[in-house]
C-alpha cells in the first residue's frame, strides 16, 4: 500500500482581521494509526495550534467530525484573525508511539496573510499656539495594518500639502505596522476656521480612505491691532475715547486703562463680535472728566492677550485746547461697546 | 453543557482495589483524551495516566504503571479508573479530567485505612 | 520526567498588592503546553491560562502568564479577595505529564 502523504491543498490563504480563516489538510491513508496536529512554523520553535486529542484549543474548530473511523478530512478554521495569526500553518500526522507520539509526514503548509485595517489617524499639532507666519508641526498617526503597503497625504481645506515626512514601522517583516507622518503648515491670519486633514488609504478600506482631522483654532493665535480715538464731545467738560481692539484670536483677553499711567480701569472682553474669518473684534469706552486735569492727559490702553506680554496704544488728551475730536476718525467694523464713567 | 460526574466515595482495605467511574455528557466522548489526576490530602496535584476513548489506547505514569487499569464504556460514556494493591498513600481526591484540561469532575474520595 | 518546580511555596500579601509566581521546568518545554491553575479549598482546580499567555474564558485581565523554555511565571496585577488560593502550573509537553507543587497566595 501506498505510503501516507498529507496534502495542504492551498499555499497561501488570505484573511481579513475579525474573520474565520479556513487551512484545509487531506490524509491519503489510515495508516499508520495516530493523531494529526496543526502547528504554526518549523522546527523546535514551532507553536502548537490544535491537537485533536488533547489541550486547549477555543478558537479552532474541525471542519469534518475526526472521530469518524474512516475520516481523512483534518481540516480546521480558526476564528477571529488577527494579524498576530499571520505565518505558516503545517499539518502533522503522527503515529503512536511510547511514551509519546512520533511525527510521521508533515504537509507542505499553508501561508496564512492578514489584511487588518488601519486604525482612524490621529492628527495632533504643537503644544503651544503660534502666530501667523509662523511654520508649525503636526503629526498623524496610524495603527495595526497589514500588509505594509499604506498611502498617506496631508490636506490644509482641500488643499494638498507637500512639505511632510513619513515613517512606516517596523522596516522588516511584522504582523502588523505603523505610520508616523510629520507635516509643516505656514500659519495666516485667516487659518482660524482651517483645518488640518491627515488621508490614509489602504487596500482593506475599499477606496474608502480614514481621515484624521486637526482644527487650527486650537493652535493659532492672532494678536490684537489696537486703535485709540477721541470721540466727539458728549459735554462740556467730557471726552470720550475708544480703544477698538480688532482681528484677535482666542478670545481670551484683558484691557486696561491707564491715565498719566496709573491704572483706572481693568476688564475681561466679554461681548465680543466675530468677524467671518474667525477672529473677534471688541471696543473699550473711557468717558474722561476734562475738568478735573489741569496738564494734558496720556491715555493708554493696554491689551494683555492670550496670556503674552502687554501691547498697547497711546491717545494724548490736550486740556488746554478746547475739547474737539481728535485723533483717527476710522470706523470700527463690527464693534462691540463697554462704556465707563471716570470722575 | 459540559458533564463530569463521578462515583461516590469510597473506603477501602490496604490490597484492596478501588474503581471509579466518571460519566461524560455534554460532548463527543471521543473526541478527546480522559486524564485522570489525583491529590492527596493537603498535598499538589499527580497525573496518573489518560485514555484514549477512540480506541482505549492508555498512557500511565510510570509510578503508576503496575497498579492502575484505565478504560471507558462508549456505549455509556463512562470512563474507569482502577487503582489496585491500595496503600495508605493512595488516599486521595480522584479527578477525571477531559482532555481539554478545561472540565474537571468533582472529585472522589478514596480513603485507605485498616 | 519534566520536574516543574514552583516558587515561593506560599505567597503572604494584602488585597491590591501585585503577586508573581514562578514556575520552572527542569528541561525546556514548548509554551504552547504551559498551563496554569488555581484550586480554592474543596473545589476541583480551574483553567486560569493555556499555553503560557492566553487566559481562559471567565478569567479577569488582572491575571497574565507569560515566559518561555524554562522559566514561566503567572503574574496578577491586583489582589482581589477572591485570588486567595492555590495556584498550580502543569505541561503536556511530554509524558508523563506533570504539575507543580504549587504556590499558596495566601492574605498577609
Known amino acids: 500500500e501506498e505510503e501516507l502523504q498529507v496534502i495542504q491543498p492551498d499555499k497561501s490563504v488570505l484573511v481579513a482581521a475579525g474573520e474565520t480563516a479556513t487551512l484545509r489538510c487531506t490524509a491519503t491513508s489510515l495508516i499508520p494509526v495516530g493523531p494529526i496536529q496543526w502547528f504554526r512554523g518549523a522546527g523546535p520553535g514551532r507553536e502548537l495550534i490544535y491537537n485533536q486529542k488533547e489541550g486547549h484549543f477555543p478558537r479552532v474548530t474541525t471542519v469534518s467530525d475526526l472521530t469518524k473511523r474512516n475520516n481523512m478530512d483534518f481540516s480546521i478554521r480558526i476564528g477571529n484573525i488577527t494579524p498576530a495569526d499571520a505565518g505558516t500553518y503545517y499539518c502533522v500526522k503522527f503515529r503512536k508511539g511510547s511514551p509519546d507520539d512520533v511525527e510521521f509526514k508533515s504537509g507542505a503548509g499553508t501561508e496564512l496573510s492578514v489584511r487588518a485595517k488601519p486604525s482612524a489617524p490621529v492628527v495632533s499639532g504643537p503644544a503651544a499656539r503660534a502666530t501667523p507666519q509662523h511654520t508649525v508641526s503636526f503629526t498623524c498617526e496610524s495603527h495595526g495594518f497589514s500588509p505594509r503597503d499604506i498611502t498617506l497625504k496631508w490636506f490644509k481645506n482641500g488643499n494638498e500639502l507637500s512639505d511632510f515626512q513619513t515613517n512606516v514601522d517596523p522596516v522588516g517583516e511584522s504582523v502588523s505596522y505603523s505610520i508616523h507622518s510629520t507635516a509643516k503648515v505656514v500659519l495666516t491670519r485667516e487659518d482660524v476656521h482651517s483645518q488640518v486633514i491627515c488621508e490614509v488609504a489602504h487596500v482593506t478600506l475599499q477606496g474608502d480612505p480614514l481621515r484624521g482631522t486637526a482644527n487650527l483654532s486650537e493652535t493659532i493665535r492672532v494678536p490684537p491691532t489696537l486703535e485709540v480715538t477721541q470721540q466727539p464731545v458728549r459735554a462740556e467738560n467730557q471726552v470720550n475715547v475708544t480703544c477698538q481692539v480688532r482681528k484677535f484670536y482666542p478670545q481670551r483677553l484683558q484691557l486696561t486703562w491707564l491715565e498719566n499711567g496709573n491704572v483706572s480701569r481693568t476688564e475681561t472682553a466679554s461681548t465680543v463680535t466675530e468677524n467671518k474669518d474667525g477672529t473677534y473684534n471688541w471696543m473699550s469706552w473711557l468717558l474722561v472728566n476734562v475738568s478735573a486735569h489741569r496738564d494734558d492727559v496720556k491715555l493708554t490702553c493696554q491689551v494683555e492677550h492670550d496670556g503674552q506680554p502687554a501691547v498697547s496704544k497711546s491717545h494724548d488728551l490736550k486740556v488746554s485746547a478746547h475739547p474737539k475730536e481728535q485723533g483717527s476718525n476710522t470706523a470700527a467694523e463690527n464693534t462691540g461697546s463697554n462704556e465707563r464713567n471716570i470722575y | 453543557q459540559v458533564q463530569l460526574v463521578q462515583s461516590g466515595a469510597e473506603v477501602k482495605k490496604p490490597g484492596a482495589s478501588v474503581k471509579v467511574s466518571c460519566k461524560a455528557s455534554?460532548?463527543?466522548?471521543?473526541?478527546?483524551?480522559m486524564h485522570w489526576v489525583r491529590q492527596a490530602p493537603g498535598q499538589g496535584l499527580e497525573w496518573m495516566g489518560r485514555i484514549d476513548p477512540a480506541d482505549g489506547d492508555t498512557k500511565y505514569n510510570p509510578k503508576f504503571q503496575d497498579r492502575v487499569t484505565m478504560t471507558v464504556d462508549t456505549s455509556t460514556n463512562t470512563a474507569y479508573m482502577e487503582l489496585s494493591s491500595l496503600r495508605s498513600e493512595d488516599t486521595a481526591v480522584y479527578y477525571c479530567?477531559?482532555?481539554?484540561?478545561?472540565?474537571w469532575g468533582q472529585g472522589t474520595t478514596v480513603t485507605v485505612s485498616s | 520526567e519534566i520536574v516543574l518546580t514552583q516558587s515561593p511555596g506560599t505567597l503572604s500579601l494584602s488585597p491590591g498588592e501585585r503577586a508573581t509566581l514562578s514556575c520552572r521546568a527542569s528541561s525546556s518545554v514548548s509554551s504552547s503546553y504551559l498551563y496554569w491553575y488555581q484550586q480554592k479549598p474543596g473545589q476541583a482546580p480551574r483553567l486560569l491560562i493555556y499555553?503560557?499567555?492566553n487566559l481562559a474564558s471567565g478569567i479577569p485581565d488582572r491575571f497574565s502568564g507569560s515566559g518561555s523554555g524554562t522559566d514561566f511565571t503567572l503574574t496578577i496585577s491586583r489582589l482581589e479577595p477572591e485570588d486567595f488560593a492555590v495556584y498550580y502550573c502543569?505541561?503536556?509537553?511530554?509524558?508523563?505529564?506533570?504539575f507543580g507543587g504549587g504556590t499558596k497566595v495566601e492574605i498577609k
Open positions: 479530567v477531559r482532555g481539554n484540561y478545561v472540565n
Open positions: 499555553s503560557t499567555s
Open positions: 502543569h505541561q503536556w509537553y511530554s509524558y508523563p505529564r506533570t
Open positions: 455534554g460532548f463527543n466522548f471521543e473526541d478527546t483524551y
